[in-house]
């Protein structure tokens, strides 16, 4: 019994004065608590608690369930305890079958013994199965068996408490261990779409998916830079043991322009937090913005191909697209397609494929697109570079030799004279007059240049070359002439000088 200094309150004394008492089933339990300030007896076993205000606790016929801790408390709050085992060969274990363990923590299998003198108090797997190799436990006859550092892999583990009695193994009822996972990573959050574009009055609905090991993950939708509570609805599922999914759906039934902004889905657990955002843009009406992918002024060589390419943003979806040239609509040679297959895509591409362009096919090519709200257009000015063509080469009545050439860009005309005795010439002749003529064709067509030289300067038989050239190519025409006496014979133009 405890001894204390005089004047200090002392704990009560219990008879019999032992810490543990063993009685047989059916025998009497008689416990006396002696204390001037006696208050009560308390009995505890598993989750059961009983009280008695008599200073003597008497149980006439003890049962196994009377096994437990009996505590006497005085008015000073001081107490003394005795543990009573009621030995019942038919009931070796008291059992509370609920068994939950938090991952990485210890958990108690509550199977206290009614007989402390049995041996080999331990845990066994159900149906003879071995326990996990790394499972460690500490038996305590008064409390049960403590499993150390519960692992996630122990979830749904079936086990029994076990003792040896008279050389035989006796098992308790079975326990199923339910492991509550520890958070070892932040929640995984994702959003149904990263951005939303709506017109005023349309419904905005966005779903955030939160995945974690258990349902105790916290989640919420927040508006960035705002404390306003948002209305959200939840659905949740357990996909297997440690795979929990929650869907939090945020809805604004009739979106307004000032609802535009960034919305954040936030989730946290004891490990940390994660978030994902979606952007809402609400516009008062639809739009189309066109971006040319090549310069809108295009130069292409005669006979070559060119692709006129535009990208455009259209919201809502484009309904009509067309390419037009000289008031005629192309029925083929073009394609229009979305820039990406993403469902929130608003960017599109349109390509007009012009093949083997002729000099006459320069001009303005226009792309038009419309949706339910707006129309838009962009024009390309296409210039076809053409090799010069010599349209006329004549001797005029005033004695001038004239060469007229057409091409794009504007041709330059050079003149050369070769006396008849020369087999190769190097002498160039300066023109008397050079004019750019207005073409009667459409704009963007060929440019016409006229150049003249004075044939009276030539004193010998010979050949004159008119050469027209630009960046695309060159063309030559030739004049042969001869003197008869003092008169020049009629000049004969010809285009080819064959070696």
């Amino acid at each position: 019994q405890p001894s204390v200094s005089p004047g200090e309150p002392s704990p009560p004394s219990i008879h019999p004065g032992k810490s543990d008492l063993i009685v047989r089933v059916g025998d009497e339990i008689r416990l006396l608590c002696t204390d001037p300030g006696f208050v009560k007896w308390t009995f505890e076993i598993l989750d059961e608690t009983n009280e008695n205000k008599q200073n003597e606790w008497i149980t006439e016929k003890a049962e196994a369930t009377n096994t437990g801790k009996y505590t006497c408390t005085n008015k000073h709050g001081l107490s003394n305890s005795i543990y009573v085992f009621v030995r019942d060969p038919a009931k070796l274990f008291l059992v509370d079958r609920s068994l939950y363990g938090k991952e990485d923590n210890d958990t108690l299998v509550r199977c206290p013994l009614t007989d402390p003198e049995v041996t080999n108090y331990s845990l066994k797997g159900c149906q003879g199965k071995p326990l996990p190799k790394d499972l460690r436990f500490i038996p305590d006859p008064k409390a049960g068996i403590m499993i150390k550092s519960v692992k996630r892999a122990y979830h749904r583990l079936c086990l029994h408490c076990s003792v040896d009695q008279e050389g035989k193994s006796v098992l308790s009822e079975k326990f199923i261990l339910k492991v509550r996972p520890a958070f070892k990573a932040v929640p995984v959050v994702s959003v149904s779409k990263a951005s939303y574009l709506l017109r005023e009055g349309e419904e905005f609905t966005v779903t955030c998916t939160i995945k974690d090991v258990s349902s105790s993950v916290y989640s919420t939708w927040k508006r960035e830079n705002s404390q306003t509570k948002l209305q959200e609805k939840y659905n949740s599922w357990h996909h297997g043991d440690f795979n929990y999914e929650r869907q939090a759906t945020l809805t604004i039934s009739s979106a307004r322009v000032n609802d535009s902004g960034v919305f954040m889905c936030y989730a946290n657990n004891t490990f940390g937090s994660a978030n994902v955002t979606t952007t809402l843009e609400v516009v008062d009406k639809g739009f189309i913005n066109i971006f040319p992918m090549i310069n809108t002024t295009v130069f292409v060589n005669d006979g070559e191909n060119v692709d006129l390419i535009v990208e455009y943003e259209a919201f809502p979806k484009p309904e009509h697209q067309q390419w037009i040239y000289m008031n005629r609509t192309f029925t083929d040679k073009w394609e229009d397609y979305p820039k990406s297959e993403n469902e929130s895509n608003i960017r599109y591409v349109s390509e007009l494929h012009l093949t083997r362009l002729k000099g006459t096919e320069g001009g303005t090519y226009t792309f038009l697109v419309s949706n339910s709200d707006v129309n838009a257009a962009i024009a390309f000015n296409v210039y076809v570079n053409t090799k010069p063509e010599i349209l006329t080469y004549d001797r005029l009545v005033n004695g001038m030799l004239q060469c007229v050439a057409a091409g794009f860009p504007e041709p330059t005309i050079d003149w050369y004279f070769c006396p008849g005795t020369e087999q190769r010439c190097s002498a160039s002749v300066l023109p008397v007059d050079v004019q750019t003529l207005n073409s009667s064709g459409p704009p963007f067509g060929k440019l016409v240049v006229q150049s003249s030289i004075d044939s009276s300067a030539f004193k010998h038989n010979g050949t004159v070359e008119c050469k027209a050239y630009n960046d695309v190519g060159k063309t030559s025409a030739y004049f042969n002439f001869a003197f008869k006496g003092n008169n020049k014979e009629q000049i004969h133009p010809h285009t080819l000088f064959t070696p």
Partner: antibody, heavy 121, light 108 residues
Framework: QIQLVQSGPELRKPGESVKISCKAS????????MYWVKQAPGKGLKWMGW????????TYADDFKGRFVFSLEASANTANLQISNLKNEDTATYFC??????????????WGQGTSVTVSS | SYELIQPPSASVTLGNTVSLTCVGD??????AQWYQQKPDKTIVSVIY???ERPSGISDRFSGSSSGTTATLTIHGTLAEDEADYYC???????????FGGGTKLTVL
């Protein structure tokens, strides 16, 4: 058929002279100019100049003025190239080619087989 | 001095098409010519006046000129097309001819 046949290979010492011939057949000799082209070993073609086969007037590229002479033996339908005071850098194959045209629209449409000249001491 | 620039070498697989280029400042207003020199040193004209073919030259050979670049294209290349190819044009007021450095074509 049109043919330009050149004289055979020549071996000379520095300071000596050499004369290469180019005999034309199969066309009217005086209707076409005769061009001369040099090709040093392992190098590209280099235009040397030309001779008017009708007037006999030669024209030389800048690098071939002085020691080089183009001449004709019109009666024999032959053009000649003479190089005097030979130098090591004259070692090359020399080609003759006929051409007709005005300024830059001519074409050298027939070529000799080339004459190899080696200058070595 | 005036130069016509040609790539030193080019290769083509038998039967394929190859394009050889020649770049010179005056080519926008001067005609280009192309000459083929076989390994035995034989020289023939294959193109003159940018795109004209002398008689007897296969139509597999074609020429073009745009701006300051002249191009010789050989379609359906044969083993016998393996050769050095030289472009030629004129320059200066005297219209002096000049050759490019040549391109060695290898047929694989």
């Amino acid at each position: 058929q049109i043919q330009l046949v050149q004289s055979g290979p020549e071996l000379r010492k520095p300071g000596e002279s050499v004369k290469i011939s180019c005999k034309a057949s199969g066309y009217t000799f005086t209707d076409y100019a005769m061009y001369w082209v040099k090709q040093a070993p392992g190098k590209g073609l280099k235009w040397m100049g030309w001779i008017n086969t009708y007037t006999g007037k030669p024209t030389y590229a800048d690098d071939f003025k002085g020691r080089f002479v183009f001449s004709l033996e019109a009666s024999a339908n032959t053009a000649n190239l003479q190089i005097s005071n030979l130098k090591n850098e004259d070692t090359a194959t020399y080609f003759c080619a006929r051409a007709r045209g005005l300024v830059d629209d001519y074409v050298m449409d027939a070529w000799g087989q080339g004459t190899s000249v080696t200058v070595s001491s | 001095s005036y130069e016509l620039i040609q790539p030193p070498s080019a290769s083509v697989t038998l039967g394929n098409t190859v394009s050889l280029t020649c770049v010179g400042d005056e080519l926008s207003k001067r005609y280009a010519q192309w000459y083929q020199q076989k390994p035995d040193k034989t020289i023939v004209s294959v193109i003159y006046k940018d795109s004209e073919r002398p008689s007897g030259i296969s139509d597999r050979f074609s020429g073009s000129s745009s701006g300051t670049t002249a191009t010789l294209t050989i379609h359906g290349t044969l083993a016998e097309d393996e050769a050095d190819y030289y472009c030629l044009s004129t320059y200066s007021d005297d219209n002096l001819p000049v050759f490019g450095g040549g391109t060695k074509l290898t047929v694989l």
